[in-house]
Structure formats: structure tokens, C-alpha cells
């Protein structure tokens, strides 16, 4: 059984067709196609809901950039 020791990688089979406001997003993670049927981005919202999104869509890329900048900026 391959990767039996590791936790299974969650996968996405469909993508949301609605743009999510960045104010609702807390974090994201990328899913690669070698482990799953589709390359995907999984956004976690501020209420801890996880949503699959298409990494090819511009709003998804913009949201990831926004979250990256948020993480890099120290909160004072």
C-alpha cells in the first residue's frame, strides 16, 4: 500500500463557479495532478469551510497572491 504512513491527499473533482471574496478567505493549498485527478486550489474560508477552485482562473490566482502578501506582511 503506497504512502500508507502518510495522510491521504484530499482531491477536487469539481470547481466552484462562483468568485469568492478575498475577505472571506483565510488560507489556501495547492493539489498536484500526480496525486489527484485534477490540479486544484483548495481555499479555506474564515469559517473553516474548504472550497475547490480552478488554478487557471484569474480570480483564483489573484486570491492566492492576496493571501501570500497577507502572510508576508507582519501584523502590528
Amino acid at each position: 500500500q503506497p504512502d500508507a504512513i502518510n495522510a491521504p491527499v484530499t482531491c477536487c473533482y469539481n470547481f466552484t463557479n462562483r468568485k469568492i471574496s478575498v475577505q472571506r478567505l483565510a488560507s489556501y493549498r495547492r493539489i498536484t495532478s500526480s496525486k489527484c485527478p485534477k490540479e486544484a486550489v483548495i481555499f479555506k474560508t474564515i469559517v473553516a469551510k474548504e472550497i475547490c477552485a480552478d488554478p487557471k482562473q484569474k480570480w483564483v490566482q489573484d486570491s492566492m497572491d492576496h493571501l501570500d502578501k497577507q502572510t508576508q506582511t507582519p501584523k502590528t
Epitope: 491521504p8 491527499v9 482531491c11 473533482y13 474548504e50 472550497i51 475547490c52 477552485a53
Partner: nanobody
Framework: EVQLVESGGGLVQAGGSLRLSCAAS????????MGWFRQAPEKEREFVAA????????YYADSVKGRFTISRDNARNTVYLQMNSLKPEDTAVYYC??????????????????WGQGTQVTVSS
């Protein structure tokens, strides 16, 4: 607990065909995706194909599109991988795996957590 048993592997010449079977037991599979993965010596395990049990939607890795076909038989709780135009680079251990789907269409799944023991496919040139 989901149990998966693969069969149908073997030795075949390049250009030939094989059909792998994966018999599933121990659960209700309507909320599952069933997938095939492969692992060649010294390489990472890679996704090959998947089918959503409920609706029958299929997904393929680019490397097998047009050559491999995944299907399922609900009555037999079995998933098949028909492999045509086999190439030496398809040589690997092929694993069947089950993935519990999320509660909604856009929610991530639990991940491929249940695995079969694997079946060896060797394609000679």
C-alpha cells in the same frame, strides 16, 4: 472498512492490451470516487484514472488519455481499467484506491485512503 482487490495484471508486448479489475467490498460506494494509480520502480506513485461511482464522471492523466478507459459495474461493485496500446513506460505496479467524496460538489474529498495490494503490469518491447 473498504477493501479493494485488484486482478488482471501480467506481461504483455508493446501495443497490446490488458484489463485490470478492482473488486470493492465493505462499504456503500455511491459517495466514492474510485481511482487507479501506478508506481514504477524508483518512481513516485502517480494518478492514472478515476471514476465517480455515483455519476460515472471520468478523469485521466494526460499520459494515458485516449489509450486507457476506466469504468465501473455497480451491480458487481467492480471498477475496470482497460489499457490499450500499451508502452514499455506503462510498466508499473497498478493500485486501486477509494476516495470518499466531500458533502458538496465543490468540497474536497477525504483523499485516497483505502488501497488494494497492487497488481504488476509489465510491458515488453
Amino acid at each position: 472498512e473498504v477493501q479493494l482487490v485488484e486482478s488482471g495484471g501480467g506481461l504483455v508486448q508493446a501495443g497490446g492490451s490488458l484489463r485490470l479489475s478492482c473488486a470493492a467490498s465493505g462499504g456503500t460506494f455511491s459517495n466514492y470516487a474510485m481511482g487507479w494509480f501506478r508506481q514504477a520502480p524508483e518512481k513516485e506513485r502517480e494518478f492514472v484514472a478515476a471514476v465517480i461511482w455515483r455519476g460515472g464522471s471520468t478523469y485521466y492523466a494526460d499520459s494515458v488519455k485516449g489509450r486507457f478507459t476506466i469504468s465501473r459495474d455497480n451491480a458487481r461493485n467492480t471498477v475496470y481499467l482497460q489499457m490499450n496500446s500499451l508502452k514499455p513506460e506503462d510498466t508499473a505496479v497498478y493500485y486501486c484506491a477509494a476516495d470518499l467524496l466531500g458533502n458538496s460538489d465543490y468540497e474536497p474529498s477525504s483523499g485516497f485512503g483505502s488501497w488494494g495490494q497492487g497488481t504488476q503490469v509489465t510491458v515488453s518491447s
